[in-house]
């Protein structure tokens, strides 16, 4: 694609190339043959994050505590506010407009990946040899107890929800 009539950081208006406003500033008036583009800084709680010809700055995102949100990074004149969720909650979307409680892994399932402010808990079924007997957002599948290492024998087989039950070995009379 060949270059356009105006260079980078310029825009074409009424047969002339005007300078775009830098990030953090909005357009007040286009340039003319005799005057430069006029730009003004964005106000408090406003931003523009690109070279632009916008006549209005965007409002910073509001991290609504009623939706479980809190400020992760305060916005500047060039960046939007970044919201995240309160402890124990995570965002429902990439834009993080609301939060939901972290999911717990049911008995028989363990935590594969602990939830973050932006992603939910990932559970996995406990494979043979492992179990989880609680509903938890943190607990992994635990390995069955090894009876042999305790000089005991398996009295009751383990499941994905229960540990094995060990007991003493039958003594030869």
């Amino acid at each position: 694609e060949p270059p356009t009539a105006c260079r980078e950081k310029q825009y074409l208006i009424n047969s002339q190339c005007c300078s775009l406003c830098q990030p953090g500033q909005k357009l007040v008036s286009d340039c003319t043959e005799f005057t430069e583009t006029e730009c003004l800084p964005c106000g408090e709680s406003e931003f523009l994050d690109t070279w632009n010809r916008e006549t209005h700055c965007h409002q910073h995102k509001y991290c609504d505590p009623n939706l479980g949100l809190r400020v992760q990074q305060k916005g500047t004149s060039e960046t939007d506010t970044i919201c995240t969720c309160e402890e124990g909650w995570h965002c429902t979307s990439e834009a993080c407009e609301s939060c939901v409680l972290h999911r717990s892994c049911s008995p028989g399932f363990g935590v594969k990946q602990i939830a973050t402010g932006v992603s939910d808990t990932i559970c996995e079924p406990c494979p043979v040899g492992f179990f989880s007997n609680v509903s938890s957002a943190f607990e992994k599948c635990h390995p069955w107890t090894s009876c042999e290492t305790k000089d005991l024998v398996v009295q009751q087989a383990g499941t994905n929800k229960t540990d094995v039950v060990c007991g003493p070995q039958d003594r030869l009379r």
Partner: antibody
Framework: EVQLVQSGAEVKKPGESVKISCKAS????????IEWVRQMPGKGLEWIGV????????NYNEKFKGQATLSADKSISTAYLQLSSLKASDTAVYFC?????????WGQGTLVTVSS | EIVMTQSPATLSVSPGERATLSCRAS??????LNWYQQKPGQAVRLLIS???RLHSGIPARFSGSGSGTEYTLTISSLQSEDFAVYFC?????????FGQGTKVEIK
């Protein structure tokens, strides 16, 4: 005094090409855009495209993309409009104009007649 | 593309009278509206740029006004040399587009 002087009238056959020139004087050639406009007989004005003579950047009207090619030679302060695959319906007066808050100064126009 | 509509197509006025020409855009053009005069055998002439800015060398009897989609060219007292065709043109959004023209003729 700003002046745009265009090349003379052309008569072409269908399928041929034509290259019109527009020589600028009286101002800094690379400081302003050059616009090109078509006026068919008895009709209004139609924008073809614009070129920045400083570095050759162009914008075309979609309608003329592929048929019109704009260029400029800084060393002789001259802009060019080339039209290819001419048809009878391309018969028109073609104008160049200097930009800067509208089409500030115009050439006298070049009549291109396409006839078999 | 933005469609520019001029009215009337022809305006019959006596010398010394006021002439009012209208130009409507199909969408807001933010005052990027220019007026041109065309006479047979002469180069097209820019009269007014950006709605109301008189181009150098243009007599003060020409004035422009308007905003949004509605624009007006006024010639306060027509002189013999003002009988011509007048075009409006928007410079807000590519492709640049022109009105179909208003012919101002002697009444």
């Amino acid at each position: 005094e700003v002046q745009l002087v265009q090349s003379g009238a052309e008569v072409k056959k269908p399928g041929e090409s034509v290259k019109i020139s527009c020589k600028a004087s009286g101002y800094g050639f690379t400081n302003y855009l050059i616009e090109w406009v078509r006026q068919m007989p008895g009709k209004g004005l139609e924008w073809i495209g614009v070129i920045n003579p400083g570095y050759g950047g162009v914008n075309y009207n979609e309608k003329f993309k592929g048929q019109a090619t704009l260029s400029a030679d800084k060393s002789i302060s001259t802009a060019y409009l080339q039209l290819s695959s001419l048809k009878a319906s391309d018969t028109a007066v073609y104008f160049c104009a200097r930009g800067g808050s509208g089409f500030a100064f115009w050439g006298q126009g070049t009549l291109v007649t396409v006839s078999s | 593309e933005i469609v520019m509509t001029q009215s009337p197509a022809t305006l019959s006025v006596s010398p010394g009278e006021r002439a009012t020409l209208s130009c409507r855009a199909s969408q807001d053009i933010s005052n990027h509206l220019n007026w041109y005069q065309q006479k047979p055998g002469q180069a097209v002439r820019l009269l007014i740029s950006s709605t109301s800015r008189l181009h150098s060398g243009i007599p003060a009897r020409f004035s422009g006004s308007g905003s949004g989609t509605e624009y007006t060219l006024t010639i306060s007292s027509l002189q013999s040399e003002d009988f011509a065709v007048y075009f409006c043109q928007q410079g807000n959004t590519l492709p640049w587009t022109f009105g179909q023209g208003t012919k101002v003729e002697i009444k």
